[in-house]
């Protein structure tokens, strides 16, 4: 068995992708390894080749079908194995039973756009990508706005505790460049985590009208 210095972590994007990371201290960088997925109640199985992402970790994506196809449900259990080549045969390094809807990480929101911008306000909308219809409205969002002279880490988080794919940013400074990001998380799942942040959307507030009190 793999000792405590090894980790095997996977997430399901709720549709047709399981992304996995395997790390093992002391493993050879050029070792050929793969992840094999066997669902308990499906006719298909899938394999992906683990590729190095750092000195001691490897990652791969199990592509289960077309991006928007619903390949797994809340009752599925997938047995995931890490196999590494040793000479002419494959050695099993780790075995994990994985409940997909307990291990969710959605794709980052897409299609961010400015709906309306004023001197102190900006209305922004976005869309979720490859998210299961099973969630219905059971999603939440976090958003952040990058102000001049600050970092993303300093930006306060705005929480939307419902499926609301828009936000009205207020108390902005006129004629100022901002960037905006949003991420999404389903409400269900023992190990469910936030999606990656969306690509930043850059926008500029309108300048204050000359001669008027702002």
């Amino acid at each position: 068995a793999v000792n405590g210095t090894s980790q095997f972590t996977c997430f399901y994007n709720s549709r047709a992708n399981i992304s996995c990371v395997w790390s093992q201290d002391g493993a050879l960088q050029d070792t050929s390894c793969q992840v094999h997925a066997w669902p308990d109640r499906r006719r298909w199985n899938q394999t992906c080749e683990l590729l190095p992402v750092s000195q001691a970790s490897w990652a791969c994506n199990l592509i289960l079908g077309a991006p928007d196809s619903q390949k797994l449900t809340t009752v599925d259990i997938v047995t995931l194995r890490v196999l590494c080549r040793e000479g002419v045969r494959w050695r099993v390094m780790a075995i994990q039973d994985f409940k997909p809807f307990e291990n969710l990480r959605l794709m980052a929101p897409i299609s961010l756009q400015v709906v309306h911008v004023e001197t102190h306000r900006c209305n922004i909308s976005w869309e979720i990508s490859q998210a299961s219809h099973y969630f219905e409205r059971h999603l939440e969002f976090e958003a952040r706005t990058l102000s001049p002279g600050h970092t993303w880490e300093e930006a306060p988080l705005l929480t939307l505790k419902q499926k609301q794919e828009w936000i009205c940013l207020e108390t902005l400074t006129p004629d100022t460049q901002y960037e905006f990001q949003v991420r999404v998380k389903p409400l269900q799942g023992e190990f469910t985590t936030w999606s990656p942040w969306s690509q930043p959307l850059a926008f500029r507030t309108k300048p204050a009208a000359l001669g008027k009190d702002t």
Epitope: G4, F8, T9, D97, K99, E102, G189, E190
Partner: nanobody, 127 residues
């Protein structure tokens, strides 16, 4: 904290199946990660399987070769070990264990990670 009682062991022929149960009482079962270990005569205690608090991830010893399935029912305060295609080398005392600390289900835990142990149930596989 919980107390653990295993059951379901016995004598079975090679190729047969057994389902072990581990009933927990006296605590909040869903706040514990649960594991199964085994100890054959003259050998060290060996990891078999471990499942997270909600059962979202379960790690198995490579030696189980996909023959064993660990599951839990938090409503019934019970964790199970379904053992299929049993071999003589599976003969051992099987122990249920509970872990009070957080377990992510992404690595193989050590027996020292578990704080609470059952008394064990004997499994004998004859050839």
């Amino acid at each position: 904290q919980v107390q653990l009682v295993e059951s379901g062991g016995g004598l079975v022929q090679a190729g047969g199946s057994l389902r072990l149960s581990c009933a927990a009482s006296g605590g909040t079962f869903s706040s514990y990660a649960m594991g199964w270990f085994r100890q054959a005569p003259g050998k060290e205690r060996e990891f078999v399987a471990a499942t997270t608090r909600g059962g979202g991830r379960t790690m198995y010893a490579v030696s189980t070769e996909g023959r064993f399935t660990c599951s839990r029912d938090n409503a019934e305060n019970t964790v199970y070990l379904q053992m299929n295609s049993l071999k003589p080398e599976d003969t051992a005392i099987y122990y249920c264990a509970a872990m009070t600390s957080y377990y992510s289900g992404t690595y193989y835990p050590d027996s020292s990670d578990f704080d609470i142990w059952g008394q064990g149930t004997q499994v004998t596989v004859s050839s």
